[in-house]
């Protein structure tokens, strides 16, 4: 028989982690493996049909994506949809596929809303999702004794798909669910310095444990301004939510692992400011299969898609599409073996959920709602040389914080700052006021 996979991803724009130039080679590798393995869909042919999720400008579109999905549905009657990755593109497509009872498989669509499976029935996320970041942060807070207050700042950049809004939304909601904690959130425009100044005035009254989602340059600017304002690492800790580790990469921008460095005359101050900074990224898979997969992926991307893939955490997305597709095909194979059909979306999806799978990204666990358990890394500066390195990983499956290579977190005072200042944010602690009174008497 024939099994049709309908792809709805950006076909022209290569900048998205889920661009077809990146995911296409991963799909090819997965399908080559299906052909090579007699236990997967014996006697079946798998073919892909493509639709674009981007508009004429090459930007993800909540109009183009559902139109492409509808066209693919009526023209090819696919057994499964692969993608979209962008939040606004995935939302309408996911609602349509739920109505059609056709599985949707993606390694994108990380926003909180896609976890609501009565609306997004049969949507399986084989990639990371933002609510899972909240699980990590909640575990971190418990361990460090921060169970009262946190502040989240997120940058707005025109045309960036509101990436930071969705990231902080998932983090915010999950942390509040997991801990009985007060969480404030503030938005700022990256290109408006007056916003930064306003943030710095607000910060001391709102939090000491601060999460920031922004570009690496905006984060560095904020850290420099915080240093100037005296918001230093003895009392504050700033977590950069840099999930793909952009700030830690070399190339055109900062030197590898030195996110404070620009060679612009402010590096000395920036290094000092970054003593108060930690960086949260997705965890880079360290299993040998992943490294081998990357080699093949890059080769295929160049040969068949005329695309040069850079190194970095973005490659975990095509790798997750690869693993997700293999998991789907495994589920179809099992469904057929039990007398089902390839159009039995519910049955196939149920076989994917609440299941573990050994893929190129390592041990992959899809939870009972069809979302992948996600691993994260926490990076911190080595005070000796100013380089950032992974100090601990979070294992999403076991929900454990895993200490790495004898390293420890760097706290300027030797211990983590409390999440609420000793006298409260507005010196409201009566004991502190008593002290002031006694000095006046």
């Amino acid at each position: 028989g024939n099994l049709t996979v309908a792809v709805v991803l950006p076909l022209a724009n290569t900048s998205y982690p889920w661009s077809w130039a990146r995911v296409g080679p991963a799909v090819e590798l997965a399908l080559a493996q299906v052909k090579a393995r007699p236990d997967l869909l014996p006697g079946w042919t798998v073919r892909t049909v493509l639709g674009s999720s981007e508009n004429a400008l090459g930007v993800c579109s909540d109009t183009a994506a559902p139109l492409a999905a509808v066209d693919l549905k009526w023209e090819h009657n696919p057994a499964v949809f692969l993608g979209p990755g962008c939040v606004y593109a995935a939302a309408p497509v996911g609602r349509f596929t739920a109505h059609w009872r056709v599985p949707l498989l993606t390694a994108g669509a990380p926003a909180l809303g896609f976890g609501v499976k009565d609306e997004y029935a049969l949507t399986t996320r084989a990639g990371p999702s933002y609510a899972k970041l909240g699980d990590f942060v909640a575990a971190l807070h418990r361990r460090l004794g921060w169970e009262r207050q946190a502040l989240m700042l997120y940058a707005y950049r025109p045309g960036d798909e509101e990436h930071c809004f969705f990231l902080v939304e998932g983090l915010f909601m999950r942390v509040r669910d997991r801990l009985n904690i007060t969480v404030d959130h503030l938005e700022f425009a990256e290109d408006d310095l007056s916003h930064y100044t306003r943030l710095l005035r607000t910060m001391p009254r709102k939090g000491r444990v601060i999460y920031i989602c922004s570009s690496p340059d905006a984060f560095r600017t904020l850290m420099l301004l915080a240093l100037e304002a005296g918001l230093c690492g003895e009392d504050y800790v700033f977590f950069h939510l840099d999930i793909f580790g952009q700030s830690l990469q070399g190339g055109q921008g900062p030197a590898p692992r030195r996110p404070w460095e620009r060679g612009d005359g402010q590096d000395v101050s920036a290094r000092q400011a970054f003593q108060a900074a930690k960086i949260i990224t997705y965890k880079d898979p360290d299993n040998p299969e992943y490294l081998e997969f990357l080699k093949q992926l890059k080769h295929l991307a160049y040969e068949q898609f005329n695309f040069t893939m850079e190194d970095g955490l973005v490659n975990t997305i095509p790798a997750s599409f690869h693993d997700g597709l293999l998991l789907y095909i495994q589920a179809v194979t099992e469904t057929l073996a039990h007398g089902g059909t390839v159009t039995d979306g519910e049955n196939i999806t149920q076989r994917m959920w609440n299941r573990s799978f050994q893929g190129v990204t390592g041990y992959l666990k899809i939870d009972s709602s069809g979302d992948r358990e996600t691993d994260f890394s926490l990076w911190d500066m080595d005070p000796e040389n100013g380089a950032f390195r992974v100090v601990l990983n979070y294992n999403g499956t076991s929900q454990e914080l895993v200490a790495v290579s004898g390293r420890k977190l760097n706290w300027p005072l030797g211990y983590p700052p409390p999440d609420i200042p000793k006298c409260g944010f507005d010196n409201e602690d009566p004991a502190c006021n008593q002290d002031h009174l006694s000095t006046l008497e």
Epitope: L144, N393, A403, G406, K408, L409, G414, Y415
Partner: antibody, heavy 120, light 107 residues
Framework: QVQLVQSGAEVKKPGASVKVSCKAS????????IHWVRQAPGQGLEWMGI????????SYAQNFQGRVTMTRDTSTNTVYMDLSSLRSEDTAMFYC?????????????WGQGTLVTVSS | AIQMTQSPSSLSASVGDRVTITCRAS??????LGWFQQKPGKAPKLLIH???SLQSGVPSRFSGSGSGTDFTLTISSLQPEDFATYYC?????????FGQGTKLEIK
């Protein structure tokens, strides 16, 4: 509650090896490091080395380099310290202790100690 | 390796006395220093971490201070159960190193 339980006392001949175990319970094994400390009779504390249970990373004090090997078994939450080429000066109490790399609290819980006697 | 020099090596004092023990590092270790108490036949017990943070369950008569290279452990009013040997430990980098210990005896 957090516990580190060490193996029993050992008597060894010079030149032999000893393997002391330290079984952890009451906390997430891979979230903390385990250190080993030696204390000869009537002497002070001497840091021997550290092992990271998650990845097996080790760092040893110069004094013990080449003679000590620290390993772990994550299936049983146990860390082992192997000291080879024993000499009489190695007669000592050996302690394992836990270290939190997040809050950076050093050696907050200790094992009860294992006495190793080296004698011909 | 960082050397830790503890002084005095022994000290006689009476119940109720205020006692101070010092520890000097051969290079700056920021606040990365702990103080331990050890009684005969027992494992050491952590009193102070990060130079001045009292470990939970430790009486408030114990306090620590200092940063960089010079550190102090103070017992404000000695109790009978405080007679023991005290050690400092630098946990700034590997290899960790202990001071040679201060034996606190009853006068």
């Amino acid at each position: 509650q957090v516990q580190l339980v060490q193996s029993g006392a050992e008597v060894k001949k010079p030149g032999a090896s000893v393997k002391v175990s330290c079984k952890a319970s009451g906390y997430t094994f891979t979230s903390y490091y385990i250190h080993w400390v030696r204390q000869a009779p009537g002497q002070g504390l001497e840091w021997m080395g550290i092992i990271s249970p998650s990845d097996g990373y080790t760092s040893y004090a110069q004094n013990f380099q080449g003679r000590v090997t620290m390993t772990r078994d994550t299936s049983t939450n146990t860390v082992y310290m192997d000291l080879s080429s024993l000499r009489s000066e190695d007669t000592a109490m050996f302690y394992c202790a836990r270290n939190d790399p997040l809050t950076t609290v050093a050696l907050d819980y200790w094992g009860q100690g294992t006495l190793v006697t080296v004698s011909s | 390796a960082i050397q830790m020099t503890q002084s005095p090596s022994s000290l006689s004092a009476s119940v109720g006395d205020r006692v101070t023990i010092t520890c000097r590092a051969s290079q700056g270790i920021r606040y990365d220093l702990g103080w331990f108490q050890q009684k005969p036949g027992k494992a050491p017990k952590l009193l102070i971490h990060a130079a001045s943070s009292l470990q939970s369950g430790v009486p408030s008569r114990f306090s620590g201070s200092g940063s960089g290279t010079d550190f102090t452990l103070t017992i404000s009013s000695l109790q009978p159960e405080d007679f023991a040997t005290y050690y400092c430990l630098q946990d700034y980098n590997y290899p960790f190193t202990f001071g040679q210990g201060t034996k606190l005896e009853i006068k």
